[in-house]
Amino acid sequence: CKAMHVAQPAVVLASSRGIASFVCEYASPGKATEVRVTVLRQADSQVTEVCAATYMMGNELTFLDDSICTGTSSGNQVNLTIQGLRAMDTGLYICKVELMYPPPYYLGIGNGTQIYVIDPEPCPDSDF
């Protein structure tokens, strides 16, 4: 497989609403025009696919309707947002980028972003 460098932040803290955003940047060796981005979650040596999207350069990045991910693309970077996260979802989120067209096919896998999710404290009852 032709390898490609993929960069992503080491650590991200999810918001109190369970939303985490990070940028996945790839060093395209050629005129990449169709790209597939996959977010993988690694926890306890198990890797699962969180979401994936294929997009043409200049077109919007569209995940499936029921996906917990949304994103936008700009040049060689993808801004990814993962929603609905809870404390149990804390883990390493790896960005995998495939240059699908034109040939040749390239694959790049980032080192992962550790996303920390802290469940919000329930609001105390107020006596007002």
Partner: antibody
């Protein structure tokens, strides 16, 4: 249904240019690459290049680089190929074809072809 | 450029009988991602080419199952289990492992 309709046959003089159109219908034009392919009389197929309708980005066969210009007009879902400095060996049928990602970027729909005859 | 070589150049066939076309590439089309970037197209007389097979062995939508594709990294075969009159035309193999995309010279299938 998906259709790619190309412009009609052209007779052009050596050294001149020709611009062929390919109007797409039946699908979202910006969702698929358009390829251009040359077929010499009674012979095989030769890839010229492709264009991404979203940003006009192209990839070309070096053999045609500098002479084949690929463009699109998304407002009318039409792709164009202009071939300049024409020579007699440019006499051929030219096809546009749509790429389909589900078929790993094979050409799943083709235009009917445009015959270009280069003759003085 | 990857060179695609087809044989035979011409193939006279009898309706109802099987037929086989060979294609060889100058470089392996089997990528380390497991995909074989080999395609078959058919150009019927007076028509534009049409896609038959993608990724070496997958039938495109609407293609009859009498067609099948097989092969290794460099040697490929298109088989028609029982030829029908409508199968006449020129068959092309093609690769899109790398640019430029290249086609074989074609095999003309005609009824005996």
């Amino acid at each position: 249904q998906v259709q790619l309709v190309q412009s009609g046959a052209e007779v052009v003089k050596p050294g001149a240019s020709v611009k062929i159109s390919c109007k797409a219908s039946g699908y979202k034009f910006t969702d698929h690459f358009i390829n251009w392919v040359k077929q010499n009389p009674g012979q095989g197929l030769e890839w010229i290049g492709d264009i991404n309708p979203n940003n006009g980005g192209t990839n070309s066969n070096q053999k045609f680089e500098g002479r084949a210009t690929l463009t699109v007009d998304t407002s009318i879902s039409t792709a164009y190929m202009e071939l300049s400095r024409l020579r007699s060996d440019d006499t051929a049928v030219y096809y546009c074809a749509r790429l389909r990602r589900e078929y790993f970027y094979a050409m799943d729909y083709w235009g009917q072809g445009t015959l270009v005859t280069v003759s003085s | 450029d990857i060179v695609m070589t087809q044989s035979p150049l011409s193939l006279p066939v009898t309706p109802g009988e099987p037929a086989s076309i060979s294609c060889r590439s100058s470089k392996s089309l089997l990528h380390s991602n497991g995909i074989t970037y080999l395609y078959w197209y058919l150009q019927k007389p007076g028509q534009s080419p049409q896609l038959l097979i993608y990724q070496m062995s997958n039938l495109a939508s609407g293609v009859p199952d009498r067609f099948s594709g097989s092969g290794s990294g460099t040697d490929f075969t298109l088989k028609i289990s029982r030829v029908e009159a409508e199968d006449v035309g020129v068959y092309y193999c093609a690769q899109n492992l790398e640019l430029p995309l290249t086609f074989g010279g074609g095999t003309k299938v005609e009824i005996k």
